[in-house]
Amino acid sequence: GYKAEVMVSQVYSGSLRVLNRHFSQDLTRRESSAFRSETAKAQKMLKELITSTRLGTYYNSSSVYSFGEGPLTCFFWFILQIPEHRRLMLSPEVVQALLVEELLSTVNSSAAVPYRAEYEVDPEGLVILEASVKDIAALNSTLGCYRYSYVGQGQVLRLKGPDHLASSCLWHLQGPKDLMLKLRLEWTLAECRDRLAMYDVAGPLEKRLITSVYGCSRQEPVVEVLASGAIMAVVWKKGLHSYYDPFVLSVQPVVFQACEVNLTLDNRLDSQGVLSTPYFPSYYSPQTHCSWHLTVPSLDYGLALWFDAYALRRQKYDLPCTQGQWTIQNRRLCGLRILQPYAERIPVVATAGITINFTSQISLTGPGVRVHYGLYNQSDPCPGEFLCSVNGLCVPACDGVKDCPNGLDERNCVCRATFQCKEDSTCISLPKVCDGQPDCLNGSDEEQCQEGVPCGTFTFQCEDRSCVKKPNPQCDGRPDCRDGSDEEHCDCGLQGPSSRIVGGAVSSEGEWPWQASLQVRGRHICGGALIADRWVITAAHCFQEDSMASTVLWTVFLGKVWQNSRWPGEVSFKVSRLLLHPYHEEDSHDYDVALLQLDHPVVRSAAVRPVCLPARSHFFEPGLHCWITGWGALREGGPISNALQKVDVQLIPQDLCSEVYRYQVTPRMLCAGYRKGKKDACQGDSGGPLVCKALSGRWFLAGLVSWGLGCGRPNYFGVYTRITGVISWIQQVVT
């Protein structure tokens, strides 16, 4: 029998340029008579144009929704009802070609053509894009709050905030023809639920979404987004009701930046420069294509690319890369944003050099990509360390911490977290190395203690980049480095003269002079530690709630012992900057560290002094007795303590802790156990210091109270942010 043909709705969106009309401000106001009259005429013209072609039989509906410069640009959508089997044949490209062909056929015609009655349409200015019914619905929902803006060259235009009576608004942005638009979004409130979406076209077409941001993102307080050309749309969706705009938008046209470089690298190891996408740190634009050619001076070297929070992965089944496509020596890789560092190592086999291409394969983009490049020795990529093949990084080997995700850095170790004697490969305790007493059979632990040695896991790196064999030589009163740098920045880690309460849980004034109390509206929220004249360190999770993210809320107290009273030694500060570790992940507690910059420098006293920061190579031995301090709850679920409490704890091997916590313990974490499990850090101690006393009598910061199961529960450990795992970031910020 007869079977009715299935028809489907195909939606197209686009724009056309009218050469004999000029844009006027009236056309930006939908309620104006000029807008109503122009849309009526433009709509009629559009319908006539479509029905003049063989698409006419499929015509369903159309709408002109906006105008722009150029001399006059009309923005529209239309729907065709197409037999299902012809759907693929009428792609946006085919439809555009049919309409252009129609326009061209009538350019020099003297015959009366209905769609040319009023408008001279430029065939070269016609653009047709694929859209959907959902896109049209999204567009229609914004039409009550539709803003068109043209930005001239050299201009920076601040956009008018949304209409808070509307639930959704659209800013339609246009710039000069051969430039690209750069949109800057700055969140101005600590907390909101607003959503903003940026598109690479005039309307909210899902397939041309550049990016969407949501809810006053603290991770990205400022976002800069590049369009591929001179047109862009921004759609706002209301979150919580607010009388204040939670964001500021501004836009400017910028010139296309070439992204092609030819470089010859020097004959030296380590980072030699930076490659980045145009206008970094702006989001890269939807049609970015970068090509970098690097020439390596010798086949002894390989090329290393060090990424920050971005990794390269093999993509299965030729799927498009959603976060940037890379081709390196004909290998296709996809970018992936991660909260970890990553390095790609490229072995060099020919002197011709290496070409690296970066392309944005889809319209959806992301934060600009920056990569440090440099050379590594192909025969020894990580001198004194282990090359982690999973992430391309050099990590300490055999130090008792599985730095490499596959744990291979801790496999096949003769001496793990100990010193290997040359004579017979026996393993001795690290503190016994270079202590003036031979412990190895022939005294190899006491050799080369006064000279530079190759850098390794436990060697200390001096400022001149040479290394010394003695473990933990910092601030011990004896210069071990030729340049004396192991004894610099040593005005730290000394307790004030205090009437120590031996064995007591309550601390006395000056006993822990680096201890900080971080307060909001007079309430102690977290602990912290003074590490420099203007910097206090704490845990990032203290600022997890959006309501806690603003610096203005916080007051930092130093020299404090009692919460309910003040004494002459205590001082308070406001916070001028709050920096969370860029890799901090709330769910896993990884990189749980934050730095607070105080509004003025501290004046050191017996009650206020910084704690010493360990070098990356500092080794805190399992079994070492250390101390945690804080005003945290004295029991699980209890109120905070009035007096500063101190608890001695014992450092625990990483693998044991990892087993107990089902392998959720990362290399940036450190564990400590308590006698009988009754001594523990508890709620309110978060961010507070875990300090260990060196033989010199100075206290070093080993950890920050981070997480754990309850408070002092038997068979569980307290988990701390491992300072040696985040020290490079701390030093980068503080210095």
Epitope: S429, Q650, I652, G673, R675, P714
Partner: antibody, heavy 120, light 107 residues
Framework: EVQLQQSGAELVKPGASVKLSCTAS????????IHWVKERTEQGLEWFGR????????EYAPKFQGKATLTADTSSNTAYLQLSSLTSEDTAVYYC?????????????WGQGTTLTVSS | DIVMTQSHKFMSTSVGDRVSITCKAS??????VAWYQQKPGQSPKLLIY???TRHTGVPDRFTSTGSGTDYALTISSVQAEDLALYYC?????????FGGGTKLEIK
């Protein structure tokens, strides 16, 4: 000075029960775990179990589960090991020891030991 | 359970000699190893914990080495009073287990 004083030697018949005691001086048992270690001539030292005198919570080595009950009386600073359904396999010296840490347990102080002989 | 193996049941030495008693764990115990000395008719005494840390009052002729699964207790110059039974113990994971013991005898 830290000391652990154990009760005297016991000679008991198979199937009977016995309760050994361990009185601490120089420290408060509430602040530590008290462990029991069994020593037999051929087997060497075997960890038997431990008690937290503060709340009575105890843990036993799997092979001794059901054989013993650990208790403590904090007022007298004393810990007890009760052994039931005795057999010749239970003939041994039993030491009470002090465990210094939560999970990483080594035994810093030991009692003098109680010799238990199970014989008909 | 973690098995601790002391391969030598007996070791002969002379006063003044250096001697090493070895102990092997069935798995990596991350330096969570203690050593005890037991003299005839006495209870064991703690010598070393965390593989390297001497307990209060232990003479410095007693030292220890090791990592991973292999550990050793060394007496740098044996004294007559050191003749005893020596046990290793892992304090890494419950149930806490001891080695079978090594008896140090005079030649």
């Amino acid at each position: 000075e830290v000391q652990l004083q154990q009760s005297g030697a016991e000679l008991v018949k198979p199937g009977a029960s016995v309760k050994l005691s361990c009185t601490a001086s120089g420290f408060n048992i509430k602040d530590y775990y008290i462990h029991w270690v069994k020593e037999r001539t051929e087997q060497g030292l075997e960890w038997f179990g431990r008690i937290d005198p503060e709340d009575g919570e105890s843990e036993y080595a799997p092979k001794f589960q059901g054989k013993a009950t650990l208790t403590a009386d904090t007022s007298s600073n004393t810990a007890y090991l009760q052994l039931s359904s005795l057999t010749s396999e239970d003939t041994a010296v039993y030491y009470c020891t002090r465990g210094d840490s939560m999970m990483v347990t080594y035994f810093d102080y030991w009692g003098q030991g109680t010799t238990l002989t199970v014989s008909s | 359970d973690i098995v601790m193996t002391q391969s030598h049941k007996f070791m002969s030495t002379s006063v003044g000699d250096r001697v090493s008693i070895t102990c092997k764990a069935s798995q990596d115990v991350s330096t969570a190893v203690a050593w005890y000395q037991q003299k005839p008719g006495q209870s064991p005494k703690l010598l070393i914990y965390w593989a390297f840390t001497r307990h209060t009052g232990v003479p410095d002729r007693f030292t220890s080495t090791g990592s991973g699964t292999d550990y050793a207790l060394t007496i740098s110059s044996v004294q007559a009073e050191d003749l005893a039974l020596y046990y290793c113990q892992q304090h890494y994971r419950s149930p806490w287990t001891f080695g079978g013991g090594t008896k140090l005898e005079i030649k």
